[in-house]
Structure formats: C-alpha cells, structure tokens
Interface confidence: medium
C-alpha cells in the first residue's frame, strides 16, 4: 500500500476534519466532570477517575487503553495531628496559630477529603526560633543577606514569599544557608492583581488562600526511592535516608492573613531595597527576630506529615499508526490535582479528552494516523512528575528508539491574554505554520489568525513579525522525555500579559479556590481559549503523526545555537583577565556551531529534493530528523544531575521552572569569582566548553549524508 492508501487520506479526513470536530462545549462539560471532587494522587478518587478515563477513551475509539501502576513515595498531612505555625511567648505559650485549613469556596462546604495546605515531602519537626525574612529565597536573595547585609540564617526559621522561582529551589537555598525551618507565603504583590476582587467575586487570592506544592529537588529522578528505574512490583527501594531530593528541614505554606501576623512584628535590619517589599502593611524588616516589644517571642513550627509508598495509576491510550506503527507521537498531561484542579490540571485534561474524542471519531470513520499516537493521563505530577517519569523509565528503550515527539498538556490556561509556547527549536516552524491556519479567539482580532494576535501581543525580541517562543524548563511532565531521553517536546497554553510577573503563576494556583467556577466565570466563559489550545496541541499532534516528512526544521536549531553561544561567551567575557590567564577559548564551540549551521542547511536542501515515494529514503531522512534531538543527549548527564542529560537545555539550577541554555557551561561560570580554587573552577569551564562543542559537532554529523 502507498502511504496515502494506508492512511486513507481523503479531503474529509485531513487536519481540518480533526480540528472541526473539536468543540468548546465538550471541553466545558469534561472540565465540569473532572472538577467536582478532589483527585489527589494516591487516593481512591483519583483511581476511580483513572478508570473512568480509561473507559471513555475506549468508547471514543482508541485501539487499546491500559492502566500502568507504580508504587512511589508520596506525602500526606497527618489527619489527626494537623500542621501549623505558632508565635510563642517566653513561657512557651502559643499566642497565635496559623489556620489549619482554607475556608471552603461557596458550594463546596460539604466536600470531604480536601487536603489542607501543606508542603509535600516536608520532614516532621517542631523547630522554634527567630524569624528571618528572605524575600523570594532566590540565590541572589541569600547573596544579598549573607554577603552584603552579613545576616546569618543558621539556626533560624526563614519566611519566604512564593513566586519568581520553583518552591523547591527556595527550600534548597534555605537549607544551604543553615535554616532550620521554612515558612512559605503568598504576598499580595505577587498573587493579588490590582483592580480585581478576591474569589469568589474575582480571580484573586483571598487572605486565607494557600498554595500547596512539593518541595523536592529531584533533578529529574522521578520516584525518590527508585531513581533511574521503574517503581514496579520487584523494585529495590532505597532507604529514606538515601532517597533523592527530600528536604531536610520542616516547611509549611500559609496565606497572607497569617503572614501579616508573623511579618508585622519583624525587627532587625530594614529591607535592603524596594524589591524586598511586598504589598502587606508591614515593614518587611529582615530580622532576625521580632522588634523590641516582642523580642522575647519566637516562632514555632508543628509539622507532622508522613511519607508513604503509595500506588499511582497512569492511563495510556494507543491509536496505532497505519504506516509507521513503531514511531510514537505522545500527547500527555496529568490527572492528579491538589484539590479540585479547576485549572491545574483539569483544564488540560479536558482538552486532552476532547482531542482523544476527535481522533476517535476520525478513526471510527476509517482513518488512521501515519504514526502511532500515544495518549497519557499521568498520575502524581504534583508530587514530582512521578507518573510520567516512572512510565518513561519503564519504557525507556522503546522511547529512545521510537519516540518522535512529546506534546505536554497540563493547564490550558494561566490567563486569557495570548498564546504561550515553549518548545524545541525543531518545532518552531510547525508552531508558526499551524497558528497561521488557526483563528484567533482574542477580542479585537476577529477574522485574524492566531499567529497574528500572538505576534502582536508577544513579539519575538529578535525576529520582526514573529512571536516569542521560549525555552523548555521543567516543572512539568515533558521533563523526562526532553531532558533525559532527548525526545523533541513542546507545550502550549493561554497566558497572561507577558509583562507581568512570570513565575508566580495565576493567583489561585494550587489553592482550594481553583474550581470549575473560577474558569467558567472569570477566565474563559465561552471556553474559546480552551478550544484554541486544543487546536494548537491537537494540531501539533496531528501534524507530527501524519505528515509524510516530519515537520522539524533543523535550521532553527542552528540559529538558536549561535544565539546561545553568543550569550554564554558574553557571560564568560565578564572575566577577561581570567579567560586570558587560564587560556579559556570558545573557538571550538563557535566552530561546531558553524559546522552545524552548514550541515543543517545542506540537509534541508536534500530534504526538499529527495524522492518521497521511496519508503527507505523517506524513513532514513525522517530518522535523521527524529534522532537529532537525541544527539544532544550526553549519556553521562550534567555535573551532579545525571538525569538532566540534554547539553543544550536544562532546568536552571536556581529555578526548576526556567530553562537554561548551555547549562553545563553556565553553571561552571556561575559565581565563579567566589570560588576558592579559581584554577579548578576555570578548568571546569574549559571542560564544559569541550563537552558542548563536541556534542554540537556530533549532532551536526548525524545530519550529514549517511555515506
């Protein structure tokens, strides 16, 4: 059979048919269905939802839908011994206690099993001591405290505001500074937009609202007890003392009403500058300790959460490819939520559900994709990307040989301003071409393309008339596929205005107030933004699975490699004397990038000209495209981060959410002026340049003519 016969492509069964089948009303209905009760990882409710999704995906027409279970380390509060923080007087009496739960939203007062706010994987403990306010607890905040202000956090309880960076990085930084406990809180400066009311009257965070979340530093390991291998029935588990990424000090989150009570008494040093002040009516003094009248009072934490090995369930659906069944395009998003999951994750899960339904409709009419499409509903993402990582560890040999692309599908919205895309450069042209074919849902852009509204609202800083596309970082389920396995990956969602704070998330993130009503009343009443995201995610999957030549453009990788080389070189050139002293040269990297650019250009020319009716040559060219991302993987991984193996991109060592380019060189250069052994430090810079140059050159050679 020819490709066309095998995939039964007729005008009715093209991308338009798939996109036209996607309906906003269905996404709305699915979101409602997925958000009526909590679906916390490891609970019976989330197992039942897994079985429901399995059943519905079968009804929609997938070839097979299986549950894949693993027994992983999770963390829960003690139901009879709640976590809280108190202010104690000199006699040890508790004169103030933080709240034990969030006031439930209207209509949800009688819902059971709402997990109270907690920091997942916090150890137990009851530390007491003086408080130090550490701003966002970023690396630079601790530099400011320790180096400039000479404030010692050793033996102190630190209080940090959420935002800017992943909470696990905050805890790691506090541990390294010697703190004995961490209090995390949401400041209105970061979680209360001016001119908007608090939930339930608007989308802002009320004073009693609290952000849950894990505080691990897994660096891509997955289940903390089985790094590198699946947590299956015969797994060998590490002891808890050897577990990967667990925090060593108690941590607890609070809302801004409770934070006010702690911060208003702070004494000691004044904030170093206005960037340390939030929006509460408190001085934002750094401490340590309380001011004069209250100087004998201390803060005490009471943390009783437990870590438990618990069964989790992924749902894996398969739509077999007609021509290349051994080539996998994966669409995955998580199902587990902290509470109702109105945005995170169910706004994404509802979109995946509708995409599956649309593909199933086409399949029932006799169509099949060229390549196999795998659909995944991941469990335990909130506990450290555990479901996706365990499944990828179990199937790593298949994935590294057969994985074409992974499209992530967590929250579909974090705002309703414009599109946001983070992806491999290989997908830039796919995203551009697709969004030019889709209608913009934005007011004022009626009849215009999504590409046009996106470009107007979020322009590329480098290329006029093009939209911004960002680097992949982490903090979501694409991590194992991209950073560990080197499978081309991408994600898309609707976002807020990009000029506002980037990493604080939306105000009600991970709170009890993240409900169906939040979305339906305030973010997307018509579900038009959800539909657009479904079209982008689904359209990418359709093209990746169905186009005869893979829709990857290797020339775009060449462009960014040059940009990243320029950037890392300019960082290094802040130390011209040391560069000279230690003979540090970037010539090998720039040479490799130049070679990559030339070889990619020639490959693209051959891609235009080859005989696409020859299945062997077609497969050969597609394999070169598929394996290009894989070629950037270093089997040894990054220093001290063996599961981050991509040489071009890794999550920032200072913020898991952000992507860093040439991370090995970047980390070697970071704060190099403070290193005790400059010769050794600059030697590591040279080694990392060598690794990067070699990897870029090796990747270039995979695109050369094969013989």
């Amino acid at each position: 059979k020819s490709s066309n016969e095998a995939t039964n492509i007729t005008p009715k069964h093209n991308m338009k048919a798939f996109l036209d089948e996607l309906k906003a009303e269905n996404i709305k209905k699915f979101l409602y269905n997925f958000t009526q009760i909590p679906h916390l990882a490891g609970t019976e409710q989330n197992f039942q939802l897994a079985k429901q999704i399995q059943s519905q995906w079968k009804e929609f027409g997938l070839d097979s839908v299986e549950l894949a279970h693993y027994d992983v380390l999770l963390s829960y509060p003690n139901k009879t011994h709640p976590n809280y923080i108190s202010i104690i007087n000199e006699d040890g009496n508790e004169i103030f206690n933080t709240s034990l739960f969030e006031p439930p939203p209207p209509g949800y007062e009688n819902v059971s099993d709402i997990v109270p706010p907690f920091s997942a994987f916090s150890p137990q403990g009851m530390p007491e001591g003086d408080l130090v306010y550490v701003n966002y607890a970023r690396t630079e905040d601790f530099f400011k405290l320790e180096r400039d202000m000479k404030i010692n956090c050793s033996g102190k309880i630190v209080i940090a505001r959420y935002g800017k960076v992943f909470r696990g990085n905050k805890v790691k930084n506090a541990q390294l500074a010697g703190a004995k406990g961490v209090i995390l809180y949401s400041d209105p400066a970061d979680y209360f937009a001016p001119g908007v009311k608090s939930y339930p009257d608007g989308w802002n965070l009320p004073g009693g609202g609290v952000q849950r979340g894990n505080i691990l530093n897994l660096n891509g390991a997955g289940d903390p007890l089985t790094p590198g291998y699946p947590a299956n029935e015969y797994a060998y588990r590490r002891g808890i003392a050897e577990a990967v990424g667990l925090p060593s000090i108690p941590v607890h989150p609070i809302g801004y009403y409770d934070a006010q009570k702690l911060l208003e008494k702070m004494g000691g040093s004044a904030p170093p500058d206005s960037s340390w002040r939030g929006s509460l009516k408190v001085p934002y003094n750094v401490g340590p300790g309380f001011t004069g009248n209250f100087s004998t009072q201390k803060v005490k934490m009471h943390i009783h959460s437990t870590n438990e090995v618990t069964r989790i369930y992924n749902v894996i659906g398969t739509l077999r490819g007609a021509v290349e069944p051994d080539r996998y395009v994966i669409l995955g998003g998580h199902r587990d939520s902290w509470v109702f999951g109105g945005i995170d994750p169910q706004s994404g899960a509802a979109v995946v559900h509708e995409i599956v339904r649309s593909f199933g409709t086409l399949k029932k009419e006799g169509w099949r994709p060229r390549r196999t499409i795998l659909f995944a509903s991941w469990d335990a993402e909130e506990f450290g990307l555990l479901g996706s990582t365990e499944w990828a560890e179990e199937n790593s040999r298949l994935l590294q040989e057969r994985g074409v692309a992974y499209i992530n599908a967590d929250s579909s919205i974090e705002g309703n301003y414009t599109l946001r895309v983070d992806c491999t450069p290989l997908m830039y042209s796919l995203v551009h071409n697709l969004t030019k074919e889709l209608k913009s849902p934005d007011e004022g852009f009626e009849g215009k393309s999504l590409y046009e509204s996106w470009t107007k609202k979020s322009p590329s800083p480098e290329f006029s008339g093009m939209p911004r596309i960002s680097k992949l970082g982490s903090g979501n389920d694409f991590e194992v596929f991209f950073q560990r396995l080197g499978i081309a990956s991408g994600r898309a969602r609707y976002t807020k205005n990009w000029e506002t704070n980037k990493f604080s998330g939306y105000p009600l993130y991970h709170s009890v107030y993240e409900t169906y009503e939040l979305v339906e009343k305030f973010y997307d009443p018509m579900f038009k933004y959800h539909l657009t995201v479904a079209q982008v995610r689904g359209g990418m999957v359709f093209e990746l699975a169905n186009s005869i030549v893979l829709p990857f453009d290797c020339r775009d990788y060449a462009v960014v490699l040059r940009k990243y080389a320029d950037k890392i070189y300019s960082i290094s050139m802040k130390h011209p004397q040391e560069m000279k002293t230690y003979s540090v040269s970037f010539d090998s990297l720039f040479s490799a990038v130049k070679n990559f650019t030339e070889i990619a250009s020639k490959f693209s020319e051959r891609l235009q000209d080859f005989d696409k009716s020859n299945p062997i040559v077609l497969r050969m060219m597609n394999d070169q495209l598929m394996f290009l991302e894989r070629a950037f993987i270093d089997p040894l991984g990054l220093p001290d981060r063996p599961f981050y193996r991509h040489v071009i991109y890794a999550p920032s060592s200072h913020n898991k959410y952000a992507g860093e380019s040439f991370p090995g060189i970047y980390d070697a250069l970071f704060d190099i002026e403070s290193k005790v052994d400059p010769s050794k430090a600059w030697g590591e810079v040279k080694r990392q340049i060598y690794v990067a140059a070699f990897t870029v050159q090796a990747a270039a050679e995979t695109l050369s003519e094969v013989a």
Partner: nanobody
C-alpha cells in the same frame, strides 16, 4: 545584581513630549540575550507594554502607541530612553523600565516613576 532606575520629569504638559531615561547598573546593556523595555501602569489598571529594544538594536513598539514612541539606547552610558510625544491626560501613569530575555525567567523591573500629564 542587575538593577534598573528610571529618571525624568514627573510632570509633563499636554501635547508636549514625555522623556524618560533608564540607567542599568550591575550588568551591561549590550549583553547578548536580553532586551530592554518600557511599560506603564495607569492608576488601578494592569501593565501596558510600550515597547522594547533588543541588544542587537532591533526595536518593537506596541501598535497602539507606535506613532508616538521612540525608544533608543546609549551603550556607552549603559542607558536606554523613552520618548512619548503629543501626550494627553490618558498618558498619566507609573512608567517602568524593565529587562527581559527570550525566557520567561529573565524579567526584572525598575521601581517606576509617576508621570502626570497636566497643564
């Protein structure tokens, strides 16, 4: 640590030109990978993007303000500037200069300066 500081008159007469300068300290304005933008916030409203200049010199403006805006850079002084001409009372706002990058993590903003347009 990079810091940004806006400077310029706090009061501008209608129909005149608003001129602001942003001084960057703790890092070079010509560093590869960053771009330098101006945004403003009207009282009680969200942030409005005005425009940005990339380290390589390319400039982008908000289409709704394009006809009235000029953003320029002086690398020798490590400064970039905003000129907004033909101002009206609707241009009264807190004006911020900001640094961004091709990533969502590179964002950094100055303290802001209130500019009132009034005769």
């Amino acid at each position: 640590q990079v810091q940004l500081q806006e400077s310029g008159p706090g009061l501008v007469k209608p129909s005149q030109t608003l001129s602001l300068t942003c001084t960057v300290s703790g890092g070079s304005i010509s560093n590869s990978g960053y771009y330098w933008s101006w945004v403003r916030q009207h009282p009680g409203k969200g942030l409005e993007w005005i425009g940005f200049i990339y380290y390589n010199g390319s400039i982008h403006y908000n289409p709704s303000l394009k006809s009235r805006v000029i953003i320029s850079v002086d690398t020798s002084k490590n400064q970039f500037s905003l000129k907004l001409n033909s101002v009206t009372a609707a241009d009264t706002a807190v004006y911020y200069c900001a640094r961004d990058g091709d990533d969502y993590g590179d964002y950094l903003r100055g303290q802001g300066t209130l500019v009132t347009v009034s005769s």
